[in-house]
């Protein structure tokens, strides 16, 4: 079960999260990500005692990494051996010596530029750190990299707004607004994303209008990430919004706290997102947000955490 | 800074074909759709068409169709639009505008046309 | 394709007054497509609202708009010496674009 990736590929785990000792040129360790493109395209660098470190933001179960390397021109630049760091604070850290006391664990990379090599961790790592460092390389320590695993209470994953595990059609609204060349459709709701209408935006700007997700089964969902969104000179989010739920799609009940009606506060502006938690979560198929108030426009893109109901048994 | 800088004044005679340009900076023209707005002397605003570089799809007014087209050149992010067969009456000042979000927020600072024999 | 009509033609009043600039639409649209402009002599038009009553970055609030379906209104609640300007209204979308005939509005 706890195999998801964390966010390389997906840009869950942002550019600010990664780190290196040093880089190559323009190849900046915010590039490490699996399966990048483009003609610079990984993390690089030509010292030897290098190591590139990546922040998870919080404890998290690592139960594995991919890794990759890259070409640049006809050469092939990778990583064929490396070992693992790992720490809860950033300050005390521990070399991963899998189930030995002794040694440490020397894992085997990539013997090509494009191929992934799979490493389990068995036993897993818990930590908010993983740093790794290459022991062997061919002509440059070259890596993409995901690194696989879940959250440590295994309940505050992304459903999969971002990564489109949650498919369009799961995704509707009471209204949406479109333009001359333009739809701001339920769908666009997802963190992150990019493009020309890259959020959902309802035909009027009004306290009833709601974006709804259906999981399709029951969820445990813990939280919400909220996002805004930019035109060119024109900010556009939710300052506040309400939580409503349902099993059947029928009758809704909004999210209380303390007794009354929970008024989540939203985005302060148009990219940083905002994570709010359910205390307590919610056991529901049907999630709908309701936007309360907003600067300029209703403009939103989101991610769910959670976990399905079932891994709670 | 956002800008659109449009292409200086000309003159032609009816029947001939004008082109105007419309340079966009400080965003990529594929990001946003390009419109286009006639303004003949002393009167008022009339829409010529609109132009997405991002698919090459135009939408024309009707009174425009088969006189106007509407290219654009990302590799510039220059927008053109051409009139053919003009008339005296094609004489205006045309403005190209940009949707920010919705309506037309940044505009060029105009190009007169004038037809005359 | 939708006509829109602006009252009156021309508004004669002085600066600190209130001024009351209507748009009618010869069939109803959703006001999020509602857009009013205005223009001086020899520059370009600058978007005032949209949305029938959002406000465009760096409006002052003495701009605001109002209405629904046929009938929308943009009103100035004390006029300065720069708002003397001709008025525009537009409504915009998915189709065809329209502009109102404008109105003038003039020092008294």
């Known amino acids: 079960k706890c195999q998801t990736p964390l966010g390389m590929a997906s840009g869950h785990i942002r550019d600010f999260q990664i780190t290196a000792s040093g880089q190559y040129g323009q190849w900046a360790p915010k590039l490490a990500r699996l399966h990048y493109s483009g003609s610079i395209n990984a993390w690089s660098t030509k010292e030897p005692f290098s190591w590139i470190k990546v922040d998870l933001l919080a404890p998290m179960i690592i139960h594995g990494i991919k890794t990759q390397g890259a070409r640049q021109k006809f050469s092939s630049l990778y990583i064929s051996q490396f070992i693992i760091m790992y720490s809860l604070d950033g300050k005390k850290w521990q070399t991963y010596r899998g189930n030995s006391t002794g040694t440490l664990m020397v894992f085997f990379g990539n013997v090509d530029s494009s191929g992934i090599k799979h490493n389990i961790f068995n036993p897993p790592i818990i930590a908010r750190y993983i740093h790794l460092h290459p022991t062997h390389y061919s002509i440059r320590s070259t890596l993409r990299m995901e690194l696989m695993g879940c959250d440590l209470n295994s309940c505050s994953m992304p459903l999969g707004m971002e990564s489109k595990a949650i498919s369009d059609a799961q995704i509707t609204a009471s209204s949406y607004f479109t333009n001359m060349f333009a739809t701001w459709s339920p769908s666009k709701a997802r963190l992150h994303l990019q493009g020309r209408s890259n959020a959902w935006r309802p035909q009027v700007n009004n306290p009833k209008e709601w974006l709804q997700v259906d999981f399709q089964k029951t969820m445990k969902v813990t939280g919400v990430t909220t996002q805004g969104v930019k035109s060119l000179l024109t900010s556009m989010y939710v300052k506040e919004f309400l939580i409503s739920s349902s099993q059947d799609g029928h009758q809704w009940t909004l999210f209380f706290q303390n007794g009354k009606v929970k008024v989540f506060q939203g985005n302060q502006d148009s990219f940083t997102p905002v994570v709010n938690s359910l205390d307590p979560p919610l056991l529901t198929r049907y999630l709908r947000i309701h936007p309360q108030s907003w600067v300029h426009q209703i403009a939103l893109r989101m991610e769910v955490l959670g976990c399905e109901a079932q891994d709670l048994y | 800074q956002v800008q659109l800088v449009q292409s200086g004044a000309e003159v032609k005679k009816p029947g001939a074909s004008v082109k105007v340009s419309c340079k966009v900076s400080?965003?990529?023209?594929?990001?946003?759709?390009v419109h286009w707005v006639g303004q003949a002397p002393g009167k008022g605003l009339e829409w010529v068409g609109s132009?997405?570089?991002?698919?090459?799809?135009?939408i024309y007014a009707r009174e425009f169709q088969g006189s106007v087209t509407m290219t654009a050149d990302t590799s510039t992010d220059i927008a053109y639009m051409e009139l053919s067969s003009l008339r005296s009456d094609d004489t205006a000042v045309y403005y190209c505008?940009?949707?920010?979000?919705?309506?037309?927020?940044?505009w060029g600072q105009g190009t007169m046309v004038t037809v005359s024999s | 394709e939708i006509a829109l009509t602006q009252s009156p033609g021309t508004l004669s009043l002085s600066p600190g007054e209130r001024a009351t600039l209507s748009c009618r639409a010869s069939?109803?649209?959703?006001?999020?497509?509602l857009a009013w402009y205005q223009q001086k002599p020899g520059q370009a038009p600058r978007l005032l609202i949209y949305?029938?009553?959002t406000r465009a970055t760096g409006i002052p609030d003495r701009f605001s708009g109002s209405g629904s379906g046929t009938d929308f209104t943009l009103t100035i609640s004390r006029l300065e010496p720069e708002d003397f300007a001709v008025y525009y209204c537009?409504?915009?979308?998915?189709?065809?674009?329209?502009f109102g005939q404008g109105t003038r509005l003039e020092i008294k």
């Open positions: 949305g029938a009553s």
């Open positions: 537009q409504k915009y979308g998915t189709s065809a674009i329209t």
């Open positions: 132009f997405d570089p991002e698919s090459g799809e135009s």
């Open positions: 069939q109803s649209f959703s006001s999020s497509y």
């Open positions: 400080g965003y990529t023209l594929t990001e946003l759709p």
């Open positions: 505008a940009v949707p920010d979000p919705d309506a037309f927020d940044i």
